[in-house]
């Protein structure tokens, strides 16, 4: 029967008596930076070309015995997970291996850097089809390694890395913390985060998604027909590298941004038990388990968006946090979140010719997060319209006044520390959905975009009694671009998007009276692109 991990990533329509999805990634080359590998293992023979690249440190310990099968163990298994004949994800993908880890699985930053440079030069000398680079390794945070990953990603290479097995914040490790890299955590057959001894999978905002990473059957270097079960975020990353190879083989023109958005979009949502993660990391960690698209074609019509969390601002009074989208993505909205509820909102601002989302901490606050909603919107022309604090008691409002521009997100930020503490909620005037409304003491920012066929609508969900969480979701066929809370509720901790749902979080209800002050309204802006839908129909 099909191994659990392959079944998990396979959409039901492919689940015959064996795993045989269409096109096994044959147009894609996957580079593996790992240990040496047994390339003539029956599972991978002819699929893996061992390059002459080797840059590894000496093994530790005077009594270390270099046993070939042990030296090859990690890399052979991963090559099998990516492209193995019987237990692989992308059975048609060809691979090239570079040895950057020694027989004890240890490597150096310099060795990995030189390996990445080797790939870059190979690509320049002999350009092939799409390239995926699998980095099933993790070390301490390294600015220089992250920068090298960024350079390679900007040259059009897809990098996939392990989140790390330290049961820790992946942002503390490299290359996991590099924003341009697709960082993968590990889950088990029960869709729970993988525990490895006293440790386990890393987590946090630097993880893009999770994938099967426990008891993964793959090629064993003990013999040419042997299989073995291994666990870890390396195995999880290998699954995503295989899925990426399949997607790129079906659509070779996909950019890194498009691929990442598709990986997120087609993942299984909300299946991971978040209680495993530290409480402060739960909201930051994506609840996504990777899966192949149900069809490798025809996803182009979709408006894809993802949520990007900033690093924590820190607690100082004027501290700010910035969330950025990838170069090919549009920032369609910006929100903020603070566990203490003490924040001064957020704003979209230009930085280096690109919009970023900046959140502001407040006096006495423990810090804030900025949350960017990053979307793929071809031919988009987006701008931010700002209204300064209003004098009128009705509050501040701003709308998209340019012809053909639609509202994709609302933000507000204020200078006073205790905005809203004694203010009644401001109600949105009916029949004016294309505008943002806020407190009169707040600056209001509207994200207004023009793109072919783009249409958006506002959806609200209000709860009169206090609730720790209020949500509102976009319907099928619409994509959440903006998420905010209607102003006037002092206990709101912030708003953020989870997949296609807008979540507004409030302070513990036990500390809040059930006056009108307790009313919470979540506001979602849902968009779709008729242009993308028509384009995909023409392609088919």
């Amino acid at each position: 029967s099909i191994p659990w991990n392959l079944e998990r990533i396979t959409p039901p329509r492919y689940r015959a008596d064996e795993y045989q999805p269409p096109d096994g990634g044959s147009l894609v080359e996957v580079y593996l930076l790992d240990t040496s590998i047994q390339s003539d293992h029956r599972e991978i023979e002819g699929r893996v070309m061992v390059t002459d690249f080797e840059n590894v440190p000496e093994e530790d310990g005077t009594r270390f015995h270099r046993q070939a099968s042990k030296c090859d163990s990690h890399g052979t298994h991963l090559a099998g997970v990516v492209s193995g004949r019987d237990a692989g994800v992308a059975k048609g993908a060809s691979m090239r291996s570079l040895r950057v880890l020694n027989c004890q699985g240890k490597g150096t930053v310099s060795g990995t850097l030189i390996g990445l440079e080797f790939i870059r030069k190979s690509q320049l000398v002999q350009p092939v089809g799409p390239l995926v680079v699998l980095l099933p390794l993790a070390g301490g945070y390294s600015r220089v390694l992250n920068a090298a990953c960024q350079r390679l990603a900007r040259a059009g290479v897809v990098l996939v890395t392990a989140a790390g097995n330290f049961r820790d914040d992946a942002c503390l490790y490299s290359p996991a913390s590099a924003p341009e890299v697709i960082t993968v955590g590990a889950t088990n057959a029960q869709d729970q985060p993988v525990t490895l001894g006293t440790l386990g999978t890393n987590f946090g905002r630097c993880v893009d998604l999770f994938a099967p990473g426990e008891d993964i059957i793959g090629a064993s270097s003990d013999c040419s027909t042997c299989f073995v079960s291994q666990s870890g975020t390396s195995q999880a990353a290998a699954h995503v590298a295989g899925i990426a190879a399949m997607m790129l083989s079906a659509e070779p023109e996909l950019t890194l941004a498009e691929l990442r958005q598709r990986l997120i979009h087609f993942s299984a949502k909300d299946v991971i038990n978040e209680a495993w993660f530290p409480e402060d990391q739960r909201v930051l960690t994506p609840n996504l388990v990777a899966a192949l698209p149900p069809s490798t074609h025809g996803a182009g019509w979709q408006l894809f968006c993802r949520t990007v969390w900033s690093a924590h601002s820190g607690p100082t009074r004027m501290a700010t946090a910035v969330a950025r989208c990838a170069p090919d993505e549009e920032l369609l909205s910006c929100s903020s979140f603070s566990r203490s509820g003490k924040r001064r909102g957020e704003r979209m601002e230009a930085q280096g010719g690109k919009l970023v989302c900046r959140a502001h901490n407040a006096f006495g606050g423990e810090g804030v997060y900025a949350i960017a909603r990053c979307c793929l919107l071809p031919q988009a022309n987006c701008s931010v319209h700002t209204a300064p604090p209003a004098e009128a008691s009705m509050g501040t409002r701003v709308h998209c006044h340019q012809q053909g521009h639609v509202l994709t997100g609302c933000s507000s930020h204020w200078e006073v520390e205790d905005l809203g503490t004694h203010k009644p909620p401001v109600l949105r005037p009916r029949g004016q959905p294309n505008q943002c409304v806020g407190h009169r003491e707040a600056s209001i920012h509207a994200s207004c975009c023009h793109a072919p066929g783009l249409e958006c609508k506002v959806k609200e969900h209000g709860i009169p009694a206090p609730q720790e969480q209020v949500t509102v979701a976009c319907e099928e066929g619409w994509t959440l671009t903006g998420c905010s809370a209607l102003p006037g509720t002092s206990h709101v901790l912030g708003a953020y998007a989870v997949d296609n749902t807008c979540v507004v979080r409030s302070r513990d209800v036990s500390t809040t009276g059930s006056t009108s002050e307790g009313a919470v309204t979540a506001v979602a802006i849902c968009c779709r692109s008729r242009h993308l839908a028509q384009a995909s129909q023409e392609l088919q």
């Epitope: 047994q38 023979e45 004949r85 059975k91 027909t225």
Partner: antibody
Framework: QVQLVQSGAEVKKSGASVKVSCKAS????????ISWVRQAPGQGLEWMGW????????NYAQKVQGRVTMTTDTSTSTVYMEVRSLRSDDTAVYYC????????WGQGTTVTVSS | QSALTQPASVSGSPGQSITISCTGT?????????VSWYQQHPGKPPKLMIY???NRPSGVSNRFSGSKSANTASLTISGLQADDEADYFC?????????FGGGTKLTVL
Amino acid sequence: QVQLVQSGAEVKKSGASVKVSCKASGYTLTSYGISWVRQAPGQGLEWMGWISVYNGNTNYAQKVQGRVTMTTDTSTSTVYMEVRSLRSDDTAVYYCARGYGMDVWGQGTTVTVSS
Amino acid sequence: QSALTQPASVSGSPGQSITISCTGTSSDVGGYNSVSWYQQHPGKPPKLMIYEVSNRPSGVSNRFSGSKSANTASLTISGLQADDEADYFCSSYTSTSMVFGGGTKLTVL
């Protein structure tokens, strides 16, 4: 192009040994092992075993285990198979083939065992 | 006694289609994606026609196709030609080795 070139025909007495060679060229040798297959006159194909050019590891079919030894000489890109204690039912054409996938075959070496 | 069972012979007229079956168990054909088919003309080495159940090596005519259902693999040759007359062998992985079928003699009438 990818080629496997085998040594010439052999005639051996019962109880003797024979060593057949197979020289590989035209591809990255370490990416594939070499399989050995034999075919008795008028009969089907029988897989005898496999050897890794990468590390010399072997995987023999149970039927011939103990009587067959496969070796490699990486300096000449040549793989050898020796069959000991030959019997008349070892009379066959012996083929080497690339890897377990056996996508490329040698021309065959006829081994005749006379009593 | 071969591990995989094939019909001893099949025949067909030029232009027709024929199918050769190869039956094993869940420990070989049913358990792996690695079923291959070989063509062998008299006095020649076998030639790989299909690998990994249904894939054709470059240079092999698209008249040859392979499939698998449970423990049985099949080779189909459409638009039979005189040159297709040969012996055909299937093979499969087992947990530690390889097994062949007994072979099927294809006669083009």
